[in-house]
Interface confidence: low
């Protein structure tokens, strides 16, 4: 991944094709790295990231990571290759058009991550019950 402020020139080595001959263009994703966030106790949040980036590689998808500890809440937005772990986790939902947050076990903090494969899909991160039904107890905590 390339941070937006050091974007490389867009050139023909980014144009690749899949097995069916379809051109795979790199995605457009929000790319603000880690920033403080006010997103808390909400069904969904906007990233408030003003930087959209063309991902460096056509296979990369959009990722958002929401973290809360005793001191602050942060939201990370990046491009990342789903074949590689991110924060030691596999991007299981990389093919999803929406960024639906799922909790991951991290000691000392609440850690949610989502990935998605439509343009700028990590601008809207979703915690809502209609999507995330895998942990009802957690939802009660979020929405109380």
């Amino acid at each position: 991944t390339i941070p937006p402020h050091v974007q490389k020139s867009v050139n023909n080595d980014m144009i690749v094709t899949d097995n069916n001959g379809a051109v795979k263009f790199p995605q457009l994703c929000k790319f603000c790295d880690v920033r403080f966030s006010t997103c808390d106790n909400q069904k969904s949040c906007m990233s408030n990231c003003s930087i959209t980036s063309i991902c460096e590689k056509p296979q990369e998808v959009c990722v958002a990571v929401w973290r809360k500890n005793d001191e602050n809440i942060t939201l990370e937005t990046v491009c990342h290759d789903p074949k590689l772990p991110y924060h030691d986790f596999i991007l299981e939902d990389a093919a999803s058009p929406k960024c639906i947050m799922k909790e991951k076990k991290k000691p000392g903090e609440t850690f949610f991550m989502c990935s998605c494969s439509s343009d700028e899909c990590n601008d809207n991160i979703i915690f809502s019950e209609e999507y995330n039904t895998s942990n009802p107890d957690l939802l009660l905590v979020i929405f109380q």
Epitope: T17, N20, G21, A22, V23, K24, F25, Q27, L28, T52, D119, E120
Partner: nanobody, 120 residues
């Protein structure tokens, strides 16, 4: 079926201007990021510019930054590329494209393209 029809190319002197258009059909235009790419004689494809579905985000190759402007009119399903201060090295066939656009095997990429020739 996705169809993209480029137009507006021609012969122009160095320092001149052209405006390319791309009429799109067969998909929900306003939901798709769109791209201009070009192929100079005897060379490979090169990215020129990209624009998000809403038109709010635009991107340019370093070689055209400050000279070219990409835009779109979603009500007309049309993509544009305004090219100013043209140089000889901008000579190429220009194609518009969307993500997942299929290559027509044994034919040009994304339709006929439009030829831009910059020469004195």
């Amino acid at each position: 079926e996705v169809q993209l029809l480029e137009s507006g190319g021609g012969l122009v002197q160095p320092g001149g201007s052209l405006r390319l258009s791309c009429a799109a059909s067969g998909f929900t235009f306003g939901q798709e990021s769109m791209y201009w790419v070009r192929q100079a004689p005897g060379k490979g494809l090169e990215w020129v510019s990209a624009i998000s579905g809403s038109g709010g985000s635009t991107y340019y190759a370093d070689s055209v930054k400050g000279r070219f402007t990409i835009s779109r009119d979603n009500s007309k399903n049309t993509l544009y590329l305004q090219m100013n201060s043209l140089r000889a090295e901008d000579t190429a066939v220009y194609y518009c494209a969307k993500s997942g656009t299929r290559i027509k095997q044994g034919f040009d990429y994304w339709g006929q393209g439009t030829l831009v020739t910059v020469s004195s």
